[in-house]
């Protein structure tokens, strides 16, 4: 298949990846679907440097990332290993809090106003960030 060698219009290139920053809100699953329709995925943060880059672009706004534990263990949407990978949780997070009264716990991760991560109810309509890697064959196996 063809390879993407430059970022689409309105996407920001950084370290051989392309990023798109939403200005509206969606539930986590809908944000995930949006990115997939763009042949991308919700952002996967693999380093402190990438964390700072994303944080700079989103500002102090709750924003979904591609990390969830809806099926048990925490998983990155692109298969990056969670246990050995970069983490930037707020103190005492993730806590799978049930006290919000919305039913269930908290299964989706987002950037908070200071950039550190929190788990929250996946239905909340937060902004989101899509990411796609450059030089990756665009004809890849289906993500679904």
């Amino acid at each position: 298949g063809s390879e993407r060698t430059c970022c689409p219009v309105n996407w920001v290139e950084h370290e051989r990846s392309c990023y798109w920053f939403s200005r509206s809100g969606k539930a986590w699953a809908d944000a995930d679907n949006y990115c997939r329709l763009e042949d991308a995925h919700l952002v996967v943060v693999t380093s402190w440097e990438e964390q700072k880059f994303v944080q700079h672009h989103i500002g102090p706004v709750n924003t979904w990332m591609g990390l969830h534990d809806q099926n048990g263990p925490w998983k990155w949407v692109d298969g990056t290993d969670y246990e050995t990978g970069f983490k930037n949780w707020r103190p005492e997070q993730p806590d799978d809090w049930y006290g919000h009264g919305l039913g269930g716990g908290e299964d989706c991760a987002h950037f908070t106003d200071d950039g550190r991560w929190n788990d929250d109810v996946c239905q909340r309509p937060y902004r989101w960030v899509c990411e796609t890697e450059l030089d990756k064959a665009s004809q890849e196996p289906p993500l679904l």
């Epitope: 298949g1 063809s2 689409p8 219009v9 309105n10 996407w11 798109w20 939403s22 200005r23 509206s24 809100g25 969606k26 539930a27 699953a29 809908d30 679907n33 949006y34 997939r36 329709l37 763009e38 042949d39 309509p125 665009s138 004809q139 890849e140 196996p141 289906p142 993500l143 679904l144």
Partner: antibody, heavy 123, light 107 residues
Framework: EVQLLESGGGLVQPGGSRRLSCEAS????????MSWVRQAPGKGLEWVSV????????YYVDSVKGRFTISRDNSKNTLNLQMNSLRAEDSAVYYC????????????????WGQGTLVTVSS | DIQMTQSPSSLSASVGDRVTITCRAS??????LGWYQQKPGKAPKRLIY???SLQSGVPSRFSGSGSGTEFTLTINSLQPEDFATYYC?????????FGPGTKVDIK
Amino acid sequence: EVQLLESGGGLVQPGGSRRLSCEASGFTFSSYAMSWVRQAPGKGLEWVSVISGSGSNTYYVDSVKGRFTISRDNSKNTLNLQMNSLRAEDSAVYYCTKGYYDSSGYYYPFDFWGQGTLVTVSS
Amino acid sequence: DIQMTQSPSSLSASVGDRVTITCRASQDISNDLGWYQQKPGKAPKRLIYAASSLQSGVPSRFSGSGSGTEFTLTINSLQPEDFATYYCLQLNSYPFTFGPGTKVDIK
């Protein structure tokens, strides 16, 4: 000028198959997710399926899951809909549609529509 | 699935009238809503996207408003070419769903 030209419609027996095609021109086809929308005679509009620009990701309405397959050939600027196990309720005009990116890069489907192709499922 | 309802289902109006069509979503869809016009035997044409943004080339007498679950399409000073069926469409989550339509005909 953007053009979408559907073909492949016709009369098919219940349980039969049909393959619809949509030939696109006037835009960079591989950069756009594409959708199929249908409209039964005298009825409203129903979204059927969507496919990402590379063809890697697809979504369907529940009523066609497992029976319809959306695909694309970016080298030929063509969108396809393979319809199997057809039922009377699949009778409709099928429209091929593309979307639109606003100034922030947000994608809005269903910006431009072809003229449609009629599929009639009847014995 | 998100259900979309429209009211009225049909209306009769005269040239020059101000026409208002309402669309309601069964859950919050933010501003992920479009409005479409369809004439008999023709493909739909988008009038409004993102609830209130006017599609390029569409006359300014068409306007959209609303957010969340309730949305409105307004046609100021109805023209002869505006007699058609109007559909709303939610793009917030799969499956994308259309409203049942509102037919605007001549009084």
